[in-house]
């Protein structure tokens, strides 16, 4: 299956972060997975380097691996948490949610 | 071995591009390869999402794959080529050379 975005809900309790994160309890993080193989197409958001690497791999798989399916756009989430002085802080954490995937 | 940049020289002849690219004959493209596994460190240039995904994978490998090792910075190269009217053009192609790798 070609490189694409998949569902993933992350629970902060599962990560052991429930003692410092007040809210939310978790979030939809998503993740990227799938093939970046020849032939590529524009849905795969392949960089020029990934295009070259795909061709090199296709011609000789020993030389390099296929490019990998990774986030091309990431969004932030806002988190309410206790700091080390037990103050309640609202903070925006960047690059937490996958918005789009591509071949890199 | 941890995610890092590796050597790769790409010959335009091998790609079959010698008919339109006049110069250079090829270029140092590099590529990224290696593990993005728990525990990550700062050398791995991991995004916040990759950190979360690494933990989710570490807790339950079935849920998600490990993040992948991909370029975090890419450079352009200048290419001298023939256009469709056989004019000689100097053009800068973005995102052709890996400058740095990281976990995504």
């Amino acid at each position: 299956q070609a490189c694409k975005k998949h569902e993933l809900y992350v629970s902060f309790r599962d990560l052991g972060w429930q003692d410092w994160i007040i809210a939310p309890e978790g979030y939809a993080a998503y993740y990227c997975e799938g093939e970046c193989a020849f032939p590529l197409n524009s849905y795969m958001n392949a960089t020029n380097h990934a295009i070259v690497q795909t061709l090199v791999h296709f011609i000789n798989p020993e030389t390099v691996p296929k490019p990998c399916c990774a986030p091309t756009q990431l969004n932030a989430i806002s988190v309410l948490y206790f700091d080390d002085s037990s103050n309640v802080i609202l903070k925006k954490y960047r690059n937490m949610v996958v918005r789009a995937c591509g071949c890199h | 071995q941890a995610c890092k940049k590796h050597e790769l020289y790409v010959s335009f002849r091998d790609l079959g591009w010698q008919d339109w690219i006049i110069a250079p004959e090829g270029y140092a493209a590099y590529y990224c390869e290696g593990e993005c596994a728990f525990p990550l460190n700062s050398y791995m240039n991991a995004t916040n999402h990759a950190i979360v995904q690494t933990l989710v994978h570490f807790i339950n490998p079935e849920t998600v794959p490990k993040p992948c090792c991909a370029p975090t910075q890419l450079n352009a190269i200048s290419v001298l080529y023939f256009d469709d009217s056989s004019n000689v053009i100097l053009k800068k192609y973005r995102n052709m050379v890996v400058r740095a790798c990281g976990c995504h």
């Epitope: 020849f38 032939p39 590529l40 197409n41 524009s42 795969m44 958001n45 392949a46 960089t47 020029n48 990934a50 295009i51 061709l55 296709f58 011609i59 591509g102 | 091998d14 790609l15 079959g16 591009w17 008919d19 339109w20 080529y81 023939f82 256009d83 469709d84 053009k91 192609y93 973005r94 995102n95």
Partner: nanobody, 121 residues
């Protein structure tokens, strides 16, 4: 911009052969690969075959052993020789070219208008 014009489609009997052609014009210098995809109504476009500038080829499952892709770089044309055609090969066949991204960040696809292949039993 790359322009792609397909030809060679038509009606053929099961077991017969057809040769599709796709002529590329315009900014063909940055084309990385060319290929053929097909689509039947209500289904997604699927890969039939693709070929790199260096002549390396890749085939979709439906095409293996029966179809052959080739290219004539001098004529900027890609061909699809289809043998032992079956009724299930009936579809609109689209020519595709995929090129380096310029000036954008990602590779670019161009598509032809498609040519209809009908295989009767």
């Amino acid at each position: 911009e790359v322009q792609l014009v397909e030809s060679g489609g038509g009606l053929v009997q099961a077991g017969g052969s057809l040769r599709l052609s796709c002529a590329a014009s315009g900014s063909i210098f940055s084309i990385v690969s060319m290929g053929w995809y097909r689509q039947v109504p209500g289904k997604q476009r699927e890969l039939v075959a693709a070929i790199t500038s260096a002549g390396s080829t890749n085939y979709g499952d439906s095409a293996k052993g029966r179809f052959t892709i080739s290219r004539d770089n001098a004529k900027n044309t890609v061909y699809l020789q289809m043998n032992s055609l079956k009724p299930e090969d009936t579809a609109v066949y689209y020519c595709n070219s995929y090129g380096l991204g310029y000036p954008g960040d990602y590779g670019i696809d161009y598509w032809g208008k498609g040519t209809l292949v009908t295989v009767s039993s």
